[in-house]
Every structure is written in C-alpha cells, then in structure tokens.
Interface confidence: low
C-alpha cells in the first residue's frame, strides 16, 4: 500500500525559502501526477500545485512566481520550494497522488510549517 | 508480487443464463486498480470493468463488477451470444489473471 | 481517436533477436506511459512492462529484465520493444497499451503483434 | 479560477440522521467533482470522485450526485464517526479549487 512522508524544517523565517520534501513508499513516483496542498490554521485546504515525475507541472497562479517543483526519482521523492515566505504561508503542508491530473486518493499525513522570525 | 487466480478456467453456460467469474488476489489488492477485460478470438483484450465496479464507456449494464480486497467477481446478467469470450483480471501495472474462458453449453 | 498501430508478425530463428514498433496517434504521446503485454498461444497476459516517453523512464516486470528492452522515438511517436535471445518460449502474441485519461486500465490496445520462434 | 461554494459552514444532525451537503461551481465541471473528509489532526480522505463514484473502502451511506455546477454530498445514516470537515474540489480545469468546507457536527 502506497504511503506518503512530508518532511521538512517546522520553522521558517520570513522571506526565507520553505524546503519541503515527500517521500512515496509502496509505489513508484512514475505514471501519477504528484501535489502539494496547504491548509493555513483554521481554513481550508489550497491546492498549490502538481507535477508529473516526466517533467510536466501546473501550479495555482496565485503562488506560481514563488513555487519550485522536482523530483528524485532514485530517491522516490519529490519536493517543493516556496520562496519569500510570509506569515500567511504559515499552515500544515500535505503531499498527494493523482491519477493523470484526477482526484487527489493518497495523501500523506501533513507537516505544520510555521513562518515567524 | 501479487498473485490473480480466476476461477472457474472454464464456463458453459447458455445465453440468457447468469455468468458469475471470481478473481482472487494472493494479498490485499486496491480496488480501484483492479480491471476485467474481455477478449474474443484474434482480437485484442479491450476493457469490460476498471476500478472494480465502474464500467467502462459502451459497455452493457448487463455486466457488473463487484468485491474489495482479496476477492473480486464479474457478473454477466442475462449473457448475450456475443459476451462468450475470455475473461481476465488485473491489477493497473502489474499482473493479470490466467482467465476464465465462457463458452456456450 | 487514440490509435495504436503495430508492427507485423515476424518469424525469427532461435537465439535471435527483433524489434516490435508501435506508432502512437491521436493524442500526446509524451503524455502517457506506454505499456507491453504477451499473452502466449491464446492463454494468459503478462505485463511486460512501461515506458515513459517524455524522458525514456522505463519499468519492468521482474521476469522480463534482460529479455525485453522498451524504447521510443519521440518524433515519430512510436515505442518500440527489442526481445533478445528468443528461444520457443518468446512465441506469442505481444500487445502496446495504454490506460484511459484518469482511469486506472489499459483502455487502448495496439492490434498485437504474432512473434514465432522456430528454426 | 473556478470558485467552488459550499454554502453551509456547519452542518448538525442526530446519528442515523440523513443529511446533505451542497457544492456550487462558478462555472460548468462536468462532472469532475471529488468529495473529501478530513477529521480533527489527520489529513482529508478521499470519498467520492468523478462526481459520483465511491472511492475503495468508502462505505454506501455516503453517496455523491450532481453535474454542471451543482453537486450535493449525501450521508444516508449518520454515524458518530463521520463528525468532520467535508470538502468539495473541482479537478476540471487548472488551478483545481476546493470549496471552503461544511462542517459536520452531531447533536
């Protein structure tokens, strides 16, 4: 059964870079597509963006001048760098699966990043 | 790796007869990966079921696709004279079935 | 209307070698992983394994390391599968297939293509 | 961006009570509509996809309708267990957008 590991450093400063990695166990990270979804404390969830383990990625418009995808596929994981962060980054981080662009079936467990100096 | 065994190799039965076919997983297997194809002599297999229960586009809703876990069934209601063909599970990117031949009595 | 085209049957001697194509049409071919698939004399379908176009990834099913070998050709959106040192077990039908947009099944076959190994 | 709007923050009912919760598009997604759960610490689950379609292991109380630009989440008989945030997304058109989530709780 696929499992998914978000790690990461819990506390950032603001205008730093938030560096966060997913670990994919139980499956191969080729022929899905791989997100990152963030859920600030209190609200909903924000689809941030996914990319394909091929190259191909697509991420929310609202954030795309600060986000950074990639993949290790020797490492089966995938990360994502979120530049000048702001205390409104400031929210649990999930990794997921999707089928070809579909609905999000796994997801890991969530990483609480805090932004503040 | 996982194991599919279907059962039975063989079936006979009549048209407008109830086919049943059991596809068994050695360990605990995603349903929504888990697809049925149909295939009749000299062609390819095409797909009858995927995520174990959904039918795929143009199919009857004579067939049906049922089961969690370990134990998986395909289900033909009233069969037709062209549904007498071979049968086959598998999981998405990994292994198929040996398959289950239906065959007109 | 997605289309997988095969190459034709082939009578190959063994301990040889041959290279099956199959030309992917109406959609993106770097976009979907392509899939190979045997199925022996009318029995059962193995999985041979995939192939990744966009950067020529590809992935195998244990049994068929070293005797299959996947590649493609991103200009002619063609795959292709090399089978080495074929002996009378390689005899079979062997299919290209892809799976459905956001579906978790091969949706699209090639039409097969019959390899028989016999001095 | 396509808004989805769940229009219904919190949600009450007694256990073996039937509720529904709804889902608006800001415009037409077919049908692509997946339904998530997410209980208090743990990340959200999916339930329902393509609108409809009950994922693996989701129990039959639990049933998704709709298509265009409504679409309605339906628990049959509540159980204890299903206290949680319930949240529509649309997976039609980039970026995909969740709706703000309906909060179940029970009386």
């Known amino acids: 059964q696929v499992q998914l590991q978000e790690s990461g450093p819990g506390l950032v400063k603001p205008s730093e870079t938030l560096s966060l990695t997913c670990t994919v166990s139980g499956d191969s990270i080729s022929d899905y597509y791989w997100s990152w979804i963030r859920q600030p404390p209190g609200k909903g969830l924000e689809w941030i963006g996914y990319f394909f383990y091929s190259g191909g990625s697509n991420y929310n418009p609202s954030l795309k001048s600060r986000v950074t995808m990639s993949v290790d596929t020797s490492k089966n994981q995938f990360s994502l760098k979120l530049g000048s962060v702001t205390a409104a980054d400031t929210a649990v981080y999930y990794c997921a699966r999707s089928q070809l662009r579909y609905y999000l079936d796994v997801w890991g467990q969530g990483t609480t990043v805090t932004v503040s100096s | 790796e996982i194991v599919l065994t279907q059962s039975p190799g063989t079936l006979s039965l009549s048209p407008g007869e109830r086919a049943t076919l059991s596809c068994r997983a050695s360990q605990s297997v995603d349903s929504n990966y888990l697809a049925w194809y149909q295939q009749k002599p000299g062609q390819a297999p095409r797909v009858v079921i995927y995520g174990a229960s959904n039918r795929a586009t143009g199919i009857p809703d004579r067939f049906s696709g049922s089961g969690s876990g370990t134990e998986f069934t395909l289900t033909i209601s009233r069969l037709d004279p062209e549904d007498f063909a071979v049968y086959y599970c598998q999981q998405y990117g990994s292994f198929f079935g040996q398959g289950t031949r239906l065959e007109i009595k | 209307e997605v289309q997988l085209q095969q190459s034709g049957p082939e009578l190959v001697k063994p301990g040889a070698s041959m290279k099956i194509s199959c030309k992917a049409s109406g959609y993106s071919f770097t976009d979907y992983t392509m899939n190979w698939v045997k199925q022996s004399h009318g029995k059962n379908l193995e999985w041979i394994g995939l192939?990744?176009?966009?950067?020529?990834?590809?992935s195998y099913n244990q049994k068929f390391k070293g005797k299959a070998t996947l590649t493609v050709d991103k200009s002619s959106s063609t795959a292709y599968m090399e089978l080495l040192s074929l002996t009378s077990e390689d005899s079979a039908v062997y299919y290209c297939?892809?799976?459905?947009?956001?579906?978790?099944?091969?949706?699209?076959w090639g039409q097969g293509t019959l390899v028989t190994v016999s001095a | 961006d396509i808004v989805m709007t769940q229009s219904h923050k919190f949600m009450s009912t007694s256990v073996g009570g039937r509720v529904s919760i709804t889902c608006k598009a800001s415009q037409d997604v077919t049908t692509a509509v997946a339904w998530y759960q997410q209980k208090p610490g743990q990340s959200p689950k999916l339930l329902i996809y393509?609108?409809?379609y009950r994922y693996t292991g989701v129990p039959d109380r639990f049933t998704g309708s709709g298509s265009g630009t409504d679409f309605t989440f339906t628990f049959s008989s509540v159980q204890a267990e299903d206290l949680a945030v319930y949240y529509c997304q649309q997976h039609y058109s980039i970026p995909w957008t969740f709706g703000g989530g309906t909060k179940l709780e029970i009386k």
């Open positions: 297939a892809r799976k459905g947009y956001g579906s978790s099944m091969f949706a699209y």
């Open positions: 192939i990744n176009p966009y950067n020529v990834i590809s």
């Open positions: 393509s609108a409809s």
